[in-house]
Every structure is written in C-alpha cells, then in structure tokens.
C-alpha cells in the first residue's frame, strides 16, 4: 500500500573538524521510494557538486572535506507523491583547531615608544591568545597588554623588553604557536662618563675618558677646538653595550675637547656630546722647577748641536721630560721659521742648550744654565733682527702658543762666566773671537746693551748646522 514518507531518524547537530568528513543521515520510510533533496541554509545542494557525496537513495549526505564556510543549517526533504513532503533539519558546527592568520614579525623600536606585535587567530571555539617571552609566559601589567585581537601592545618600551617573543593560540581542539620573533629595543646614544677638564703643566700627558652607551653601541669621535683630533692616541673598548674611549694627549696648548657619541636608528642618527677643557698652568714653571735627573740626550732635533754623550737635565715637572723638552725645541723652530743663515746655527745652539741644559750629576742633579755672554751673542749679534721680531710678536700676541717663552732664555737672568766659570755652560757652536765678528754685516743699528767679551776661541770659525733640522 502506498505510504507517505516518514523521517525515522531526524537530523542532529553535527560537529566536524576542518578538512574532515561530516555526514548527515536522513532515514525515510515510505512507499513508493521518495525523492530526497538537501539544502544548506535554504539553498539547494546540487547533486553534481563534487564537494558532497549523496548516497543510500539520498538518505546520506557527506561533506567530503569540511571547510570553515560549511557552517550552517542542513535540511533534508522527502517526497513520494503520497501525502505531503516531510523535512528534518540539523546544524553543522565546524570546529577548528587554532590557526594564526597574522603572525608576529621582528620589530626594532626606540626606547620609550609603543610597540605592537600582531597575532591574529582563527579557530572554533575562538582561541585564547597568550604570549611567551624567552621561555616564560609573559605577564601583563600596566605597560604590557594582550589586545582583544590577540596582538601584544607594549607602552613606553624599555631595554628589558627586548628579547624573543611568540604567541600561543589555544582552544579545546589544540594549540598553535607562532614562530619566534625578536623585539629589538634601540636606545639613543647617551654619555655615561663625560671627560673631565684638566689644568696641567706644559708637556704633561693627559688621558681624557669618555664612556657612552646606547643600542646599537655608539661610536665615539673626539673633536679638538671644533676639528677632528689631529694628535694623540685613542684606545677603545666595548663591554656590555658600553663603549669606553680614552684619548691620550701630550699637552702643548690649551684646548676644548669634545666627545661625540653617535648611533644609528634606521636612517636617522642620535648623538650625545660632552666637552672638557685643557688649560695650561703657569707656562714658565718647568724652567723654574729644578727637579729632574741627568741622562744622555737621545732625541733627534738637538743631536747635531749637543756634545756627544753629554748629560742633559730632564725636568720631571713634565710627565715625560724627554718628549716634552724635545717637542719644545721642535716647536720653537716652527715658531721662529724665517731666520738668516747666520742666525740659524746660533739659535739652534742656544735653544738646544737652554731646553736640554747641561746637567751636573750629584746628590741633587742640577741644570747648568747657559752663560750670559753666549746668550747675548746670539741675541745681539747673530740673531738681532730675528730677536726683535720675536719680541714684537710676543708683545702683540701673535704667537699661536706661549711655548716660545719657555724656549728662549732671558739673557739678563743668566749667570756670567766671569762670576764663576763652572756655574754656566758655554755653547761649543759659538766658539769664536772678536776678529771673526768683523766679517758679519751689522744686524742692528742700536749698540749692544752690554759689551760682549772675548769668548773662548776655537780653531774653526764656521758654525755647525744640523743637516736634518733647520729653522727655515
């Protein structure tokens, strides 16, 4: 007998995982056999849709690989022409393991700014998102928060926020981890230890320290009076993101030394500066202070002028007497560049014997000053014009430094060889007698201020000139 269709197993809610198979069963009793059609969200599912399989005369609907979009209400309708059509409906709930759709990326950020590390997820049930820093779960606080979207927001980024991060998406079906990303916190260059100002004696060694930090580690450059440092040695060391730069200077003039720390953030630079002044205390003190020792001269400038193996006085008021006195002589040549061939050897002899004075060893090593008569011979005869120019420049303040004040003796303050022949030193290069002087042209219209006595005569009236160093 004909029988109207009856659905004996109503459709139920089906939970299915993405990419898995989901089947709805719609068991129908009827005679004749019914036609069964299926709809999803009231839209007919076509028999030839390859994503579905319809079997058992239409009573089984199988979704071959569930997709996220398959969520919805599925209904089966049975009709055999006897009585009315019957329908049963059930829901497909697509369950999804967590999936991170927008993972975090490496971030470089400047300290104090806001950083956001994205972590957008999918999943059903909706995954909860947490973050791991290093090997430990990240705790939220007033600065650090996980947003509704799953992204991590860090306000006022600090150095200690730097590190490796990953986000974790979790629901009842599983857990997904992002790849590990790096948060790099860059820090503007900052000077931790500024160089200190010094008031030192001429010829001292001074080491200026400048310590800076920053991320990346800054570079340090030194500026002397507005220009790149032209002399001195720089030693640097880097430890724990701190750079320590030491500029060792041999002080021959005052100066303003600036330490500049620079680091780069993308295309921009940050710099920090600190300055120190080097002033020179009482220029003439080294000449007054007779603390020192006797040693052979082993320098260059006066090698041809000073007697071989002669002991010279090295003044320990300088940090490195030998170098300081050598530089004094060398600089004196540069300060007094244009001199006549007559003046040059005499001036060399005077300067070398004045700065590297003969030394009398003993319990207290003592410098032996040049005899006044030799000094006056250079001043009033050999170098009269040059001496006047120098004195004029001194009065007008045209010298770059005051070093020449140390280099040139005041003749009137020197002992006379007539007082005590052993109390002063002669200049071997000026061994001449009054007869030799007749050949020299007059150097000054003024009469010498003192009568120049006969100086010890020598077999040669020529002057020895250093082949390497001259005043021209």
């Amino acid at each position: 007998l004909p029988k109207a269709p009856v659905i004996t197993t109503p459709l139920e809610t089906v939970d299915a995982l993405v990419e898995e198979v989901a089947t709805f069963m719609c068991a129908v009793e009827s005679y004749p056999q019914p036609e069964i059609s299926w709809t999803r969200n009231k839209i007919l599912i076509k028999l030839f849709d390859t994503r579905y399989s319809i079997r058992e005369n239409g009573q089984l609907l199988t979704i071959l690989s569930v997709e996220d979009s398959d969520d919805g209400i599925y209904c089966c309708t049975a009709n055999n022409g006897v009585g009315g059509a019957v329908e049963s409906c059930g829901a497909l709930q697509v369950k999804m393991k967590p999936k991170i759709t927008r993972p975090p990326i490496n971030v470089k950020i400047i300290e104090g700014l806001k950083a956001v590390l994205p972590c957008t997820t999918m999943g059903n049930p909706k995954p909860s998102v947490s973050w791991i820093k290093g090997d430990s779960p990240l705790r939220e606080n007033s600065r650090i928060a996980v947003l509704e979207s799953g992204s991590l927001r860090i306000h006022n980024v600090q150095k200690e926020d730097a590190g490796q991060y990953r986000c974790v998406a979790k629901n009842s079906l599983g857990t997904a981890y992002s790849k590990v990303v790096k948060l790099e916190v860059e820090v503007f260059a900052r000077i931790l230890r500024a160089p200190e100002s010094h008031n030192v004696t001429f010829g001292s060694f001074v080491t200026l320290h400048c310590t800076a930090t920053g991320i990346p580690v800054p570079t340090i450059t030194w500026i002397e009076n507005g220009n790149a440092v032209s002399s001195g040695s720089i030693q640097e060391s880097v430890k724990d993101r701190v750079i320590d730069s030491r500029l060792q200077l041999f002080i021959t003039k005052p100066g303003l030394y600036t330490c500049i720390a620079t680091n780069k953030h993308g295309e921009k630079f940050s710099t920090a500066k600190a300055a120190a002044t080097i002033s020179i205390a009482e220029w003439s003190k080294p000449q007054k202070d007779n603390k020192g020792y006797c040693a052979q001269y082993r320098g260059e400038v006066c090698n041809a002028v000073l007697a071989k193996d002669a002991l010279v006085f090295l003044n320990t008021s300088y940090a490195d007497p030998e170098e300081a006195q050598e530089l004094l002589v060398h600089t004196a040549w540069n300060e007094l560049k244009v001199v006549s061939p007559v003046c040059r050897p005499a001036a060399e002899a005077l300067l070398c014997n004045h700065i590297f004075q003969e030394c009398s060893p003993g319990v207290v090593p003592t410098p032996i000053p040049i005899c006044r008569e030799y000094c006056l011979a250079v001043k009033e005869l050999f170098c009269a014009k040059e001496w006047l120019v120098m004195e004029e420049k001194t009065h007008r303040g045209l010298y770059r430094s005051e070093m020449h004040l140390l280099s040139v003796p005041e003749c009137s303050k020197l002992p006379s060889m007539h007082w005590d022949p052993t109390a002063c030193a002669r200049l071997p290069h000026l061994d001449y007698n009054k007869e030799n002087l007749k050949t020299f042209p007059p150097m000054t219209s003024s009469k010498p201020s003192v009568d120049i006595p006969n100086l010890p005569s020598s077999s040669s009236s020529s002057f020895s000139v250093s082949p390497t160093y001259s005043m021209t």
Epitope: S231, S233, Q296, E300
Partner: antibody, heavy 121, light 112 residues
Framework: ELQLVESGGGLVQPGGSLRLSCAAS????????MSWVRQAPGKGLEWVSA????????YYKESVKGRFTISRDNAKKTLYLQMNSLKSEDTAVYYC??????????????WGQGTLVTVSS | QAVVTQEPSLSVSPGGTVTLTCGLS?????????PDWYQQTPGQAPRALIY???SRLSGVPSRFSGSFSGNKAALTITGAQPEDEADYYC????????????FGGGTKLTVL
Amino acid sequence: ELQLVESGGGLVQPGGSLRLSCAASGFTFDDYGMSWVRQAPGKGLEWVSAIPWNGGSTYYKESVKGRFTISRDNAKKTLYLQMNSLKSEDTAVYYCAKRSGRIAFGALDAWGQGTLVTVSS
Amino acid sequence: QAVVTQEPSLSVSPGGTVTLTCGLSSGSVTSSNYPDWYQQTPGQAPRALIYSTNSRLSGVPSRFSGSFSGNKAALTITGAQPEDEADYYCALYMGSESRNYVFGGGTKLTVL
C-alpha cells in the same frame, strides 16, 4: 682602536730579500717614533731598527746594518723594513712597535701581532 | 758590546713581592740607559709596563714599579697575581756606542 698590522713575512732562501710592511691605524702615525723588534722561535726579544716621527734619522742593530733599511710613509701611515742578504739567523717573528713619543728610542707602548720570516734553503 | 743581564727565572707566591733586575755585563745601569720593562705572555705580543726607569704606562696596575737597585735597574711586583706569570724583558738605551736599544735575555716569572 689603535692597531698595527704587519705583513710581508714568509719563507725565503738565504741571500734573498723580503719587504715587511706595518699598517697603522687609530693614532696619529706621524707623531710617533716606530721600531722593528724580532723574536726567534723560543728565544727572547731583539731590537732591530728604529726611526723617529719624521724619518729624519734611522738606527739599526749592528748585525743588520747595511742589509736592512727602515723607512716610513707618513701619508700612508705605514712603516717598512726592507731586508736584503737574509741569513738563517734572521729567522724570527718580526714585530712592528710604536714608540710612546716622537723620538726613535724609548718604551714601545703598542705592538702588532707579528709576521713570521723564515730563512731556509 | 755590553750584554744586558736578567735572572733567567724567578718564582713568587700569589700576593707576594718579587724584584726582577736588569744589569750590564760591564758597568752600571744609569738613568742614561732609560730602562724600560716589558711583559710577554705565551703567544702574545709584548706589552710595555715601565718606561725611563720608573714611569708606569697608562693602564698598567700600580703593583708594578720601577727603580734602581745598586748598579742595576729593577722591576718590583708587589702583591703578585696569577696573571702576572709571564716573561719579563728589560731594555736599555745604549747611546755611547752607536745609539742602540738592547733587550735583556728575559726572566721567566712563575706565580706558584
């Protein structure tokens, strides 16, 4: 950072020649005297030659006089040692060293890592 | 030519004091020899410690000091540390002959 880097060492036959170079950086090269010092394998240090800041004079150990020539190029910040008529006793690590001041002699306050010169047939 | 002499080896206990000397085979060491002292650890380049008898170079610990002792130059290490174990060389300026700089044979210092 102050650096002295020697180069030019190697194996050479007795009677042969080598030219050592020392590239300086991190300091004002033309403000300092420079020296070459050598150290034979397992032996002590031996001063070889020195030159002041301006290259105006040169100084040598007696046994290398006439065979070795020290020179400097302040523009290139480089020190050189030209070694001719090499002997087996010249085999050593050759160090380039910086003086603490301008003159040729005195404390050597910075050293390179050395370059090995082997004189052998 | 004068030879610069040093003790071949010396030993000191950690925290102890030791004095290394530097002499000349003929004559005395004077300030005209400008004695310098160097330290060399195995496989490393030498490092200057003291120049011109008693001036310490920058960065050298204050436990190292230089002086004259009789007719010799001396290097004293006060409060020796394990890292002070090294070869120590003195160097003298020889000006009277033909301007030379001569190293001593070195002293091997062991910190026991």
